[in-house]
Interface confidence: low
Amino acid sequence: HGTELPSPPSVWFEAEFFHHILHWTPIPNQSESTCYEVALLRYGIESWNSISNCSQTLSYDLTAVTLDLYHSNGYRARVRAVDGSRHSNWTVTNTRFSVDEVTLTVGSVNLEIHNGFILGKIQLPRPKMAPANDTYESIFSHFREYEIAIRKVPGNFTFTHKKVKHENFSLLTSGEVGEFCVQVKPSVASRSNKGMWSKEECISLTRQYFTVTN
């Protein structure tokens, strides 16, 4: 085979709900013809399955072949460099890819105002790749929690936090007016999954939203 190719230095998964992406770092001094072979092993079926013979990118979307992740014991992946007839040794992910490795996200956050309260509704993710019965709430059926961060604009550093246990929440604005910006980070109390903060959603509160009660 001539000179041996170096192996990819590292291989890892970055995953959100039904969005499972394998990443790797390139070999040093790769040529224009260098590509990467990807293989996948499902725990319980102890054989490697070739997924891609020649990927020229540094990532590969494995969602379609790991759709049963949330009902399985997990996966490992491996990648090797290929250049013509030469190939490197395999580099294997150093941890099992399981439901625990999935970063939790929300789909979106909707805000409205009612009598001085900001009412929020968290929309759960609905990825197109997910099988019909595999909803976020069926897979994470208990102990869903959300950290809510509220920022009043202007004032980048004056904000509050609260944790809620439902997809609907309310925030009392203490009679203040102005623009309020809200972000949400999901978690599941019984699990160790990391959560990703949602994009900021803002809503303007003016005096017209307050009703006077005697």
Epitope: R151, F157, F159, Q183, K194, G195, W197, S198
Partner: nanobody, 126 residues
């Protein structure tokens, strides 16, 4: 996997100084919120000082003017210089980091950190 390891705690007389360090490893993100939090026995965990990836800092009112947070990006180490220590500063001090995208502004009320160290004890006697 991200790991945070605190050091530098100990016992000191009121008015003395300590410097806490937190070594961070296992991440390559340029955007982060890192900080020091503390928990005294029987009390809730509270924010002490935080630093954002742009270098902006924020302090709890109780430590302003006495504590200074800083980060050495080359060494991937977070520091907390604590001067004029008081007995009420006695607590377990934790280093924490949030490396997520879209995070809210980094502030001392921010308890939504993804990664926490195991803590280092600071005891200030009168």
């Amino acid at each position: 996997q991200v790991q945070l390891q605190e050091s530098g705690g100990g016992s000191v007389q009121a008015g003395g100084s300590l410097r806490l360090s937190c070594g961070a490893s296992g991440y390559t993100y340029s955007g982060y919120c890192m900080g020091w939090f503390r928990q005294a026995p029987g009390k809730e965990r509270e924010g002490v000082a935080v630093i954002d990836s742009d270098g902006s800092t924020s302090y709890a009112d109780s430590v302003k003017g006495r504590f200074t947070i800083s980060k050495d990006n080359g060494k991937n180490t977070l520091y907390l210089q604590m001067n004029s220590l008081k007995p009420e500063d006695t607590a377990m001090y934790y280093c924490a980091a949030d490396l997520g995208h879209y995070r809210p502004p980094c502030g001392v009320l921010y308890l939504g950190m993804d990664y926490w160290g195991k803590g280092t004890q600071v005891t200030v006697s009168s």
